[in-house]
Interface confidence: low
């Protein structure tokens, strides 16, 4: 029979390969069937009989077409700082990811081996880089004209309110206190972000303030009406 209509097991043509979802068994020297996900090879093929597959036992799995003699063990149960985002089934391993407010400090092939709590920026400091699934929060001191009065892993430095009459000037950890009834918020370019040095993560050829709608973007020049061009020696 031509190879494309052959039934397993069959000998491949010289120099030929086995078809999709088949494997070449070195002992039998035949093309034999693989087992589907969720099963494993209970009995390997011979020259006259095809692979015998059997379902994976509880807490074991195979994710791919295979000819493994035993299914893989599912990972251990998720720890208290993790949540199970994918349950252990016969076809897939358990996947544990970090809880909200935590990040993966040590990853593994799928999911996370070790979670750590996102650091909190204390008053006077704001989030310069938000935490991600795999990286911690980075804090920076609030620049003049901005403040953060919280201990938080999400709050950025915010601009001081502008008073008609100032009762108490603001500082890095406290907003300005006004005596008038209608304070306004500073809208200085980049004021809601902490200025920091030019970043290689910026997509610009020279740094420019990020739009105020992007709190995660913090690669800015100092707060002010007209940031100096790169290489400027101005204050």
């Amino acid at each position: 029979l031509p190879a494309q209509v052959a039934f397993t097991p069959y000998a491949p043509e010289p120099g030929g390969t086995c078809r999709l979802r088949e494997y070449y068994d070195q002992t039998a020297q035949m093309c034999c069937s693989k087992c589907p996900p969720g099963q494993h090879a209970k009995v390997f093929c011979t020259k006259t009989s095809d692979t015998v597959c059997d379902s994976c036992e509880d807490s074991t799995y195979t994710q791919l077409w295979n000819w493994v003699p035993e299914c893989l063990s599912c990972g251990s149960r998720c720890s208290s700082d993790q949540v199970e985002t994918q349950a252990c089934t016969r076809e897939q391993n358990r996947i544990c990811t970090c809880r909200p407010g935590w990040y993966c400090a040590l990853s593994k092939q799928e999911g996370c081996r070790l979670c750590a709590q996102l650091r909190k920026c204390r008053p006077g400091f704001g989030v310069a880089r938000p935490g991600t699934e795999t990286s911690d929060v980075v804090c920076k001191p609030c620049a003049p004209g901005t403040f953060s009065n919280t201990t938080s892993s999400t709050d950025i430095c915010r601009p001081h309110q502008i008073c008609h009459v100032v009762a108490i000037p603001g500082n890095a950890s406290m907003d300005a206190v006004c005596t008038s009834t209608s304070p306004t918020r500073s809208m200085a370019p980049g004021a809601v972000h902490l200025p920091q040095p030019v970043s290689t993560r910026s997509q610009h050829t020279q740094p420019t303030p990020a739009p105020s709608t992007a709190p995660g973007t913090s690669f800015l020049l100092p707060v002010g009406p007209s940031p100096p061009a790169e290489g400027s020696t101005g204050d």
């Epitope: 400090a105 650091r119 909190k120 920026c121 006077g124 400091f125 880089r129 991600t132 990286s135 911690d136 929060v137 980075v138 804090c139 920076k140 001191p141 609030c142 620049a143 003049p144 500082n171 890095a172 200025p195 920091q196 040095p197 030019v198 970043s199 290689t200 993560r201 740094p207 800015l220 020049l221 100092p222 707060v223 204050d235």
Partner: antibody, heavy 119, light 106 residues
Framework: EVQLQESGPVLVQPSQSLSITCTVS????????VHWVRQSPGKGLEWLGV???????DYSAAFISRLSISKDNSKSQVFFKMNSLQADDTAIYYC?????????????WGQGTTVTVSS | EIVLTQSPALMSASPGEKVTMTCSAS?????MYWYQQKPRSSPKPWIY???NLASGVPARFSGSGSGTSYSLTISSMEAEDAATYYC?????????FGAGTKLEIK
Amino acid sequence: EVQLQESGPVLVQPSQSLSITCTVSGFSLTSYSVHWVRQSPGKGLEWLGVIWSDGGTDYSAAFISRLSISKDNSKSQVFFKMNSLQADDTAIYYCARNDDGGDYAMDYWGQGTTVTVSS
Amino acid sequence: EIVLTQSPALMSASPGEKVTMTCSASSSVSYMYWYQQKPRSSPKPWIYLTSNLASGVPARFSGSGSGTSYSLTISSMEAEDAATYYCQQWSSNPLTFGAGTKLEIK
């Protein structure tokens, strides 16, 4: 015990590049950033750049065109590379640790590596 | 960039004398940091967040200031305090250091 150790010392020809490795111990590069600072003979301190715990980098605008900082967390090493060195780049080069969420001081410094640019 | 001007550049003090050195910023900064450096040694953190003493720093040291004017004070000079002191800011791009105040013992 927290330690930072720069490789070196180094003699570099003018227009050539400089590579320094800062090997750290006693803390993880996934939790702390590392700054690079230099000090010219008889002069003060000059900040060059930083690599953050998350791998991001920031450079002084004066050096951004010729400076590159990278790291290997698993080997606890930070790599510093500066191109096109001239005589006025002769200095002691330091790496220093900084907690990204802490007091924001460079709390531990390497002993420094002496870099001489000369033909 | 923000320029930090330290004064005096060089000063000497007798044991027991009160010492004050200043750091003036060309623009307002949120916090000031101070480092101590002795010859043939790396800088050491000395004062952080304007007024907090780093670990191991004697209580005779203090830091103060706001805006553009900051100072480091030693209430009673001791021989081991002879060193160069640098101020540092990172409230704006780039992080900058002052040129240093060299403090000698009389």
